[in-house]
């Protein structure tokens, strides 16, 4: 993971200011309201398990 202002996060991840690291966009299916999900270009998350 890298600090903001350096190289971007790898494909499929997005920078989380809250957690101070790159986070997996795939986790937005479970936690769509996470702030870093705004930086994920994937299609809207599918309905989650619960």
């Amino acid at each position: 993971e890298q600090a903001p202002g350096t190289a971007p996060c790898s494909r499929g991840s997005s920078w989380s200011a809250d957690l101070d690291k790159c986070m997996d966009c795939a986790s937005c299916r479970a936690r769509p309201h996470s702030e870093f999900c705004l930086g994920c270009a994937a299609a809207p998350p599918a309905p989650f398990r619960l």
Epitope: D18, D20, C25, R31, A46, L50
Partner: antibody
Framework: QVQLQQSGGGLVQPGGSMKLSCIAS????????MSWVRQSPEKGLEWVAE??????????HYAESVKGKFTISRDDSKSRFFLQMNNLRAEDTGIYYC??????????WGQGTDLTVSS | DIVMTQTPASLAVSLGQRATISCRAS??????????MHWYQQKPGQPPKLLIK???SLESGVPARFSGSGSGTDFTLNIHPVEEDDTATYYC?????????FGGGTKLEIK
């Protein structure tokens, strides 16, 4: 660095109770969902319970086999979480691991603690 | 519950060769974008260690000798070239729904 330090476990009689604890350090504990996973030769790795974060209203989920018997809880102010186990039976015997997940995979793991239910 | 079936149960591979472990889910664990399948390595006396997340994404610090592939119901973990240190039991796990379930494990021995 990230650490999950477990305590509790040991020998307990059938029908008895036990409380496991896990203290976290090195990551933003309050943002993560926390789980207990157990392992036995008979059942392999088995997810037991999960407690989500404040933003998810501290929702809890349990494996069907422990519903009504086990209670998971957390204390974000002290970066710790717990598993209260009641009415224990022989099939609850195993190694219990605490683990953290942001959403999907079990990222960090405790060292494991043994629970033996036997008379 | 989603049943995870791992094959083979045990595997012996010569040093430097390829180890292939398969995991089949009883229903699809993929969307059009991501697969909710993860792989772990466990050595005796230690907790499991995350190797691969979301079917093919290598966890930070894990050697590139490890790779994952698959979607839907069928997934594969490859290790190439295998090293002595890879002697361990490997598990798959889905996070499609609750309950999360694990495969029965594959014990890898290096010849």
């Amino acid at each position: 660095q990230v650490q999950l330090q477990q305590s509790g476990g040991g020998l307990v009689q059938p029908g008895g109770s036990m409380k496991l604890s896990c203290i976290a350090s090195g990551f933003t504990f309050s943002s993560y969902w926390m789980s207990w996973v157990r392992q036995s030769p008979e059942k392999g790795l088995e997810w037991v319970a999960e407690i989500r974060s404040k933003s998810d209203n501290y929702a809890t989920h349990y494996a069907e086999s422990v519903k009504g018997k086990f209670t998971i809880s957390r204390d974000d102010s002290k970066s710790r979480f717990f598993l209260q186990m009641n009415n224990l039976r022989a099939e609850d015997t195993g190694i219990y691991y605490c683990s953290s997940t942001y959403a999907d995979y079990f990222h960090y793991w405790g060292q494991g603690t043994d629970l033996t239910v036997s008379s | 519950d989603i049943v995870m079936t791992q094959t083979p149960a045990s595997l012996a591979v010569s040093l430097g060769q390829r180890a292939t472990i398969s995991c089949r889910a009883s229903q699809s664990v993929s969307t059009s974008t991501y697969s909710y399948m993860h792989w772990y390595q466990q050595k005796p006396g230690q907790p499991p260690k995350l190797l691969i997340k979301y079917a093919s994404s290598l966890e930070s610090g894990v050697p590139a000798r490890f790779s994952g592939s698959g979607s839907g119901t069928d997934f594969t973990l490859n290790i190439h070239p295998v090293e002595e240190d890879d002697t361990a039991t490997y598990y798959c796990q889905h996070s499609w729904e609750i309950p999360y379930t694990f495969g029965g494990g594959t014990k890898l021995e290096i010849k």
